[in-house]
């Protein structure tokens, strides 16, 4: 990601004058190097503050997990604290439901509910007050071409992810389709390989938009192929945040 | 993007004469006279705002870990007018990095950083305060089927765009995958044309979701195929906006 | 929608969900537009139907959203394309689909792409197909800026309130 360092930030110091020039330059640098941190330390000693320390890390989220060195975790910073109590918001993470269905997790990983927002798989998401909400959803899908080769049309699958309003204060009428996305996938097969499944394919179907919701209305996600949902971390989620 | 620093912003400092020697001596005095009070003021100004200190890390989610040294974004470096000073937000635009990498532009075109939000390619995006953020990313990809026809499986490529969190209050260990999109592309070939590349294909992999972040945590994008990124305007970007 | 199985908006089949007059003291500029289903060979944005609305200063002029006040806005748009398979004998030329949100501003002498997605579809290989493109991001906009869209593949749009939309809200 580009080695960004002092050379890139400070320009090239090309001293071609006398020895004194070099000394003077060095003096200037040393002056700065001593004066600034000492002053900083002096001021910080006198002023109450909540600063993080020096952070050095090695981070590679690739195949091997590598160790993070020297992180300073401040004791008062609890990750599960509700950081924004006044704002109705939710972020729900896809989780397998018994019987190959798509369920949603409200507490694990990055999932959360704030400010009276309620959720369960059966009931959907209920927002606590009337307002303008930005609703969003992403569903990751994965699959393989079935064995047997043959007609590519027979292998095509159209994946749909939809967000509906229904139930609660909305009432018992037709659930209202709010936002939806779709993607047709045609998995490939090696013509030479007549038996066996094709390689894994992946796709994501996502969307987001503004919807005016009333307190007690319920919002839920409907998907066409629950058996193809990719539950890998970060792939499948939906949420809402009040914006007005 | 490369190494952005004083060289790019302030010209090269080239001392070539004895006149400069005298200037250098004076500089040393002036340095002290200016550095101390300015540092005091700067520290006093920054402390109440909960600013993080120096961050040094080795973070490359690709194959090689490259080092980013001491990148400090000074508060006065605001690209154009900050239209809403109270709102931490950022929109970064994909730009080629030396060696076929994906870098991010913070000032050109529609890119911006507001309210203490900091960014470097080495360290990612650092948000200045605890809160609920809507994070988003879209990466455009393009390519051609390689020449020679053959096995369609061999032509398939699964493109992934991922958003990770690391550092700060989040603590040590492997960076945390927050949100991810994926798309498998199988470029088609004209069976009549046995040699030469296939037609251009295009796709986009994007997502967005709410994440509760703390000051000092950094967010960065990881992609599977930097060589296939489409840098055309509006195609590749990532950003964050505080919503609560 | 025959052949692709997307159901029309339930709002068309059930009673209209009442529009909300939000009683918040701090209404923020916001807009959500939907593609006009009656215009099959163009993409015209509508703000006065179904769930579409203009709020607190946003206006729609010449098919563009006019930004009411300077600030940071989240801008988003989605389109869904559909099509039928060609007959096996027909030679399938790739279909180029694209959707872009553009900014026209006094600061620029031309339309600037803000959000852009494109896709090549090969209908000959597939039965009826669907493809959606969604994108959204935050932008610093100035009062009077115009937000518009450009789409390639308009005849293939699935024009329903849930599939083709364009919006923005102040942050």
């Amino acid at each position: 990601m580009g080695a960004l360092g002092l050379e890139g930030r400070g320009g090239r110091l090309q001293g071609r004058g006398s020895l004194l020039l070099a000394v003077a330059g060095a003096t200037s640098l040393v002056t700065l190097l001593l004066a600034v941190p000492i002053t900083v330390l002096a001021v910080l000693a006198l002023v109450p503050q909540d600063q993080g320390g020096l952070v050095t890390e090695t981070a590679d989220p690739g195949a091997q997990a590598q160790q993070g060195l020297g992180f300073q975790k401040l004791p008062e910073e609890e990750p599960e604290t509700d950081l924004s109590p006044g704002l109705p918001a939710a972020h729900l993470i896809g989780a397998p439901l018994k019987g190959q269905g798509l369920g949603w997790e409200t507490t694990k990983e990055q999932a959360f509910l704030t400010s009276g927002t309620q959720f369960s798989d059966a009931e959907g998401l209920a927002l606590p007050q009337d307002g303008l909400y930005y609703l969003y959803c992403l569903v990751g899908y994965r699959g393989r071409a079935p064995p047997g080769g043959g007609d590519p049309q027979g292998r095509s699958v159209t994946l749909r992810s939809s967000l509906y309003r229904a139930g609660g204060a909305y009432g018992p009428g037709t659930p209202e389709l709010l936002l939806e996305g779709a993607e047709t996938v045609t998995p490939v097969l090696d013509p030479a390989r007549r038996q066996g499944y094709g390689p894994l394919w992946y796709t994501s179907v996502g969307f987001g938009g503004l919807v005016q919701l009333r307190r007690g209305e319920r919002v839920y996600v409907n998907i066409s192929h629950p058996d193809m949902v990719d539950f890998a971390r970060g792939k499948t989620f939906f949420g809402a945040v009040m914006v007005g | 993007m490369g190494a952005l620093g004083l060289e790019g912003r302030g010209g090269r400092l080239q001392g070539r004469g004895s006149l400069l020697l005298a200037v250098a001596g004076a500089t040393s005095l002036v340095t002290l006279l200016l550095a101390v009070p300015i540092t005091v003021l700067a520290v006093l100004a920054l402390v109440p705002q909960d600013q993080g200190g120096l961050v040094t890390e080795t973070a490359d989610p690709g194959a090689q870990a490259q080092q980013g040294l001491g990148f400090q974004k000074l508060p006065e470096e605001e690209p154009e007018t900050d239209l809403s000073p109270g709102l931490p937000a950022a929109h970064l635009i994909g730009a080629p990095l030396k060696g076929q990498g994906l870098g991010w532009e913070t000032t050109k075109e529609q890119a911006f950083l507001t309210s203490g939000t900091q960014f470097s390619d080495a360290e990612g995006l650092a948000l200045p305060q605890d809160g609920l953020y809507y994070l988003y990313c879209l990466v455009g990809y393009r390519g051609r089927a390689p020449p020679g026809g053959g096995d369609p499986q061999g032509r398939s490529v699964t493109l992934r765009s991922s958003l990770y969190r690391a550092g700060g209050a989040y603590g040590p260990g492997t960076p945390e995958l927050l949100l991810e999109g994926a798309e498998t592309v199988t470029p088609v070939l004209d069976p009549a044309r046995r040699q030469g590349y296939g037609p251009l294909w295009y796709t986009s992999v994007g997502f967005g979701g709410l994440v509760q972040l703390r000051r000092g945590e950094r967010v960065y994008v990881n992609i599977s195929h930097p060589d296939m990124v489409d840098f055309a305007r509006g195609k590749t970007f990532f950003g964050a906006v505080m919503v609560g | 929608l025959p052949g692709v199985g997307l159901t029309p908006s339930a709002a068309q089949t059930a009673r209209q969900h009442p529009k909300m007059h939000l009683a918040h003291s701090t209404l923020k500029p916001a807009a959500h537009l939907i593609g006009d289903p009656s215009k099959q060979n163009s993409l015209l944005w509508r703000a006065n139907t179904d769930r579409a609305f203009l709020q607190d200063g946003f206006s729609l002029s010449n098919n563009s959203l006019l930004v009411p006040t300077s600030g940071i806005y989240f801008v988003y748009s989605q389109v869904v394309f559909s099509g039928k398979a060609y007959s096996p004998k027909a030679t399938s030329s790739p279909l180029y689909l694209a959707h872009e949100v553009q900014l026209f501003s006094s600061q620029y002498p031309f339309h600037v792409p803000l959000l852009s997605s494109q896709k090549m579809v090969y209908p000959g290989l597939q039965e009826p197909w669907l493809h959606s493109m969604y994108h959204g991001a935050a932008f610093q906009l100035t009062q009077g800026d115009q937000l518009s869209t450009h789409t390639d593949g308009i005849p293939h749009l699935v024009l329903s309130p849930s599939t083709v939309f364009f919006g923005a809200f102040a942050l």
Epitope: G101, Q118, E123, A126, G168, P172, G173, T174, S224 | - | A10
Partner: antibody, heavy 116, light 107 residues
Framework: EVQLQQSGPELVKPGASVKISCKAS????????MNWMRQSHGKSLEWIGR????????FYNQKFKDKATLTVDKSSTTAHMELLSLTSEDSAVYYC?????????WGQGTSVTVSS | DIQMTQTTSSLSASLGDRVTISCRAS??????LTWYQQKPDGTVKLLIY???KLHSGVPSRFSGSGSGTDYSLTISNLEPGDIATYYC?????????FGGGAKLEIK
Amino acid sequence: EVQLQQSGPELVKPGASVKISCKASGYSFTGYFMNWMRQSHGKSLEWIGRINPYNGDSFYNQKFKDKATLTVDKSSTTAHMELLSLTSEDSAVYYCGRGYDAMDYWGQGTSVTVSS
Amino acid sequence: DIQMTQTTSSLSASLGDRVTISCRASQDISNFLTWYQQKPDGTVKLLIYYTSKLHSGVPSRFSGSGSGTDYSLTISNLEPGDIATYYCQQVSKFPWTFGGGAKLEIK
């Protein structure tokens, strides 16, 4: 006109299974959830579970998860409930009801009698 | 599971009367309460959803109110066709549960 037409009464032996049906007409079958309830003689209603005809996803009251299996046949716009390992306590009238939570249309009920 | 209690299992009233049937939940159900009418022949109809919203086609003589754990159904100007058993149902927390029913008879 919306109608939910349930299958006729059933007399079954203990330990056996029975599959009752609910034929929907007059609306888009995949657009609404289908619920199932039971009412034992002279008693109140109990909610058994709900199925989404669009994709077959179902939710069960834990009390009935080993007793009932919900399915749909989209081609015939019919919802089915199979009752397993029946005992005399399963003798009741079973209803289907359309709705996400509140149910605006109900079937006429299917009487199931478990007796040797 | 949330328990729904209808304290009055049967009541009788005269034609033209105003009748109130109450229902209590074992915990706060945030207005997610529904009322049904079951006629003597077993036919079930939806009357009210989300505490107070009248289902289409239901006469305005029927009304609902309440919050938290306490809810009620009121029938004003009682008519012969109102002879039925009335059930409350919570749809706040899975699994949905019904009250024991209140059988209304005409004096």
